[in-house]
C-alpha cells in the first residue's frame, strides 16, 4: 500500500526573466527513491537518478539547472513557461508518486508565492 504523500510548492508565480525553484518532497513513507523525473506537460525537463545522477534534457540545458536537492531551477523565465509542472517520484517498493506545481510567469513585478499543498 502506498502511504506516502508529495508536498510541493503548490501554485507559484514568478517574474518574466527571473528564476524559480520547483520543489517536491516525499514524506510519510520509508520507500527508497530511485529516481525523480521533472516534466512540463508531456515534455521531460530532467531526471535525477539515484545511481547515475542528473540528466538535464538537451532541449532545456540553457534554462534549467539541477537542484537544490531533488528540486529543479528554471531560469530566464518567459510567459510561455506558464503551466503545469510535475515531479514524478519512482520509489521502491511503493511505486510512483506524482506532485503537481502550477507556475504562472507574470509580466509585472507582482509575483507572489502561493501556499503549499499536498497530493497523495
Amino acid at each position: 500500500m502506498m502511504t506516502g504523500t508529495i508536498e510541493t510548492t503548490g501554485n507559484i508565480s514568478a517574474e518574466k526573466g527571473g528564476s524559480i525553484i520547483l520543489q517536491c518532497h516525499l514524506s510519510s513513507t520509508t520507500a527508497q527513491v530511485t529516481q525523480v523525473n521533472w516534466e512540463q506537460q508531456d515534455q521531460l525537463l530532467a531526471i535525477c537518478n539515484a545511481d547515475l545522477g542528473w540528466h538535464i534534457s538537451p532541449s532545456f540545458k540553457d534554462r534549467v539547472a539541477p537542484g537544490p536537492g531533488l528540486g529543479l531551477t528554471l531560469q530566464s523565465l518567459t510567459v510561455n513557461d506558464t503551466g503545469e509542472y510535475f515531479c514524478i517520484y519512482h520509489t521502491y517498493p511503493d511505486g510512483t508518486y506524482t506532485g503537481r506545481i502550477f507556475l504562472e510567469v507574470l509580466e509585472s513585478s507582482v509575483a507572489e508565492h502561493g501556499a503549499r499543498f499536498q497530493i497523495p
Epitope: Q35, H55, I56, K61, A65
Partner: antibody, heavy 118, light 113 residues
Framework: QVQLVQSGAEVKKPGASVKVSCKAS????????ILWIRQAPGQGLEWMGD????????NYNEKFQGRVTLTADTSSSTAYMELSRLRSDDTAVYYC???????????WGQGTLVTVSS | DIVMTQSPLSLPVTPGEPASISCRSS????????????LAWYLQKPGQSPQLLIY???TGESGVPDRFSGSGSGTDFTLKISRVEAEDVGVYYC?????????FGQGTKLEIK
Amino acid sequence: QVQLVQSGAEVKKPGASVKVSCKASGYTFTNYWILWIRQAPGQGLEWMGDIYPGGHYTNYNEKFQGRVTLTADTSSSTAYMELSRLRSDDTAVYYCTRYYGPYAMDYWGQGTLVTVSS
Amino acid sequence: DIVMTQSPLSLPVTPGEPASISCRSSQSLLYNSNQKNYLAWYLQKPGQSPQLLIYWASTGESGVPDRFSGSGSGTDFTLKISRVEAEDVGVYYCQQYYSYPFTFGQGTKLEIK
C-alpha cells in the same frame, strides 16, 4: 557485461519500411537512453533520435521527423527503430547506443546494414 | 544546429610520435550549472562500431589507454595521443551532446606512415 545486440542485415525496396531491433543486457534498461545513429557508406555519423525506456520519452532529428519511430519494450529490454518510406540514400549502417546525461554514448551495438535498392 | 568542425581530416603519423586533433563547435558546449563541457571523442576502428574515448571533454572512459587525453572548453577542443600505436588507426570523431540534435565532426582519419 553491458551488451547491445542488433538484428541482422536487411535489404529493402524504395518506399518500404524497415524495423531494426537492439536487445540490451548487462544493465538496467530503463535507466539509460537508447540513441540511434546512422552511417552511410564511407560517410560520418548522424544522430537520428533517442528514446528513454524508463518513461518512453522520445526525441527525433527533424531531418527524419515523420519517417522514424522509436519504441522500447521493457519486458524484453529491446529497443526498436522503424524507418518508413525508404529511399536509396537511406542505405547505411544503423547503430544503437546507450547514453545518460553527462556520460555520452559508452556502449554501441554492432550495427545493422540496411540496403535500399530496387 | 551546432556545427562541429574537425581538423585535420587526414593525419599520417609515425608510430611512437604524438598526434593532435582539433574540434571546434559553433556554440559553447559548457553547461554553467556543473561547469562541464558536453563534448565527447570516439574512435571508429576499421570495420568496427565507434568506441567512446573521452566524455566531458577531458574525462577518459574506463579502459581507455592513458595515452589518450582531451582538453579544451567552450568552443575549442583537442584530442591528443601522446605516443601513437599501430592499433590507434581509424577515424576519430568529436561529438556534442549539449543540445539537440546531437552532432558529430566530419571525422579525422589517422593512418600510420
